[in-house]
Interface confidence: low
Amino acid sequence: LDSPDRPWSPLTFSPAQLTVQEGENATFTCSLADIPDSFVLNWYRLSPRNQTDKLAAFQEDRIEPGRDRRFRVTRLPNGRDFHMSIVAARLNDSGIYLCGAIYLPPNTQINESPRAELSVTERTLEPPTQSPSPPPRLSGQLQGLVIGVTSVLVGVLLLLLLTWVLAAVFPRATRGACVCGSEDEPLKEGPDAAPVFTLDYGELDFQWREKTPEPPAPCAPEQTEYATIVFPGRPASPGRRASASSLQGAQPPSPEDGPGLWPP
């Protein structure tokens, strides 16, 4: 530190507004105007009551992980810029963030950056023709019910559409003839006989994430003989099904990577 009366250099925190889909990484950049000899950089989130909650801290090229390992601070090569990232952002990560810097003694000074806003949006449902998700104020169970009913209705509509197309293209089908490839082939019996409509919803999130690691299946209406809705066995995305601590990418570095890494 050069002198006790050294002027403080401002901090910037960008972008001022950041929007990511849930499950994606959200990265802000905290920048120092110059590089003090010894300093601590803290990353904060503003709580609803305007309190600052510390997410992570950085000093002298070592990071002290906070309680939630999803929050990471990385110093960039230029030494002045720091990436502050949320690994696998969740809907409830939406909010106001900032960084703060502390010069160490003898001229201890504290400064905070301007605020920045993060918006984490729900992952877009597939296919794009899917009806829009219900407003956030709907409870998790109600939302699950709405999605279930919507799924059945879409299935019914598709089935009716297909029936209409078949009726138009193959008029004989309406007179009870077999619609299979060969008239000689007997009509297939069993579960595969009916057409199967695969509605790929991607990762359905029924907002029960906080209650259970794996959301229970939504209650489906009883009358579902019109279509079979197949949910493909896709692995869950880290931000949605896996706990933060199970993410390999979100693990704190091993002690060999550097000092100052503390056990939980």
Partner: antibody, heavy 118, light 113 residues
Framework: QVQLQQPGAELVRPGASVKLSCKAS?????SFWMNWVKLRPEQGLEW???????????HYNQKFKDKAILTVDKSSSTAYMQLSSLTSEDSAVYYC???????????WGQGTLVTVSA | DIVMSQSPSSLAVSVGEKVTLSCKSS????????????LAWYQQKPGQSPKLLIY???TRESGVPDRFTGSGSGTDFTLTISSVKAEDLAVYYC?????????FGGGTKLEIK
């Protein structure tokens, strides 16, 4: 001017508990970790642990995990260390010390002499 | 835990003499990412609390006389007092802040002849 005020002495019975205080002034209390260190003449200095006054996060030396509990009262800028199940081995001077960042202990209190005696 | 060893445990010197205190760690305190050694030196005078002298192994704390110099890297460190004064009578401790738990050396007691 940074100051850490600690009571001079505490006399306690074996098996009892004691809660030591450390009142901070002259700096932003919630900005820096508060550490606690034990000094016995023959054993030298031992680091007990530290607490972040900002959110009460704690890190302990495993040796003192079941002996000490570190807390803070932000409203009064005071850090506390409660020592339980005291024995003669716990007779020592206990210091609080501020830590700027994750580094050296910059400022120390005057220490509290704890004497465990029947 | 990182073990810190100091030597000698005590020594008596005359005013004006040069003194060298040694501190060794059981593992390197040098962090390759920033080439800094995570070691501090403290002075504890009789009846007083410890006082920070040196951090980052060689950075003198504000207000500390320039006769105190810290040096060394990795596992071997030295605190040198270029010309001892009577007020330097104290116990000197080294401490690593590289990893949890922070550990101190056993101390070197400096006595004045």
């Amino acid at each position: 001017q940074v100051q850490l005020q600690q009571p001079g002495a505490e006399l306690v019975r074996p098996g009892a508990s004691v809660k030591l205080s450390c009142k901070a002034s002259g700096y932003t209390f919630t900005s820096f970790w508060m550490n606690w260190v034990k000094l016995r003449p023959e054993q030298g200095l031992e680091w007990i642990g530290r607490v972040d006054p900002y959110d009460s996060e704690t890190h302990y030396n495993q040796k003192f995990k079941d002996k000490a509990i570190l807390t803070v009262d932000k409203s009064s800028s005071t850090a506390y260390m409660q020592l339980s199940s005291l024995t003669s081995e716990d007779s020592a001077v206990y210091y609080c010390a501020t830590q700027f960042g994750f580094s050296w202990l910059a400022y120390w209190g005057q220490g509290t002499l704890v004497t465990v005696s029947a | 835990d990182i073990v810190m060893s100091q030597s000698p445990s005590s020594l008596a010197v005359s005013v004006g003499e040069k003194v060298t205190l040694s501190c060794k760690s059981s593992q390197s305190l040098l962090y390759s990412s920033n080439q800094k050694n995570y070691l501090a030196w403290y002075q504890q005078k009789p009846g007083q609390s410890p006082k920070l002298l040196i951090y980052w192994a060689s950075t003198r704390e504000s207000g500390v006389p320039d006769r105190f110099t810290g040096s060394g890297s990795g596992t071997d460190f030295t605190l040198t007092i270029s010309s001892v004064k009577a007020e330097d009578l104290a116990v000197y401790y080294c401490q690593q802040y590289y990893s949890n738990p922070y550990t101190f050396g056993g101390g070197t007691k400096l006595e004045i002849k």
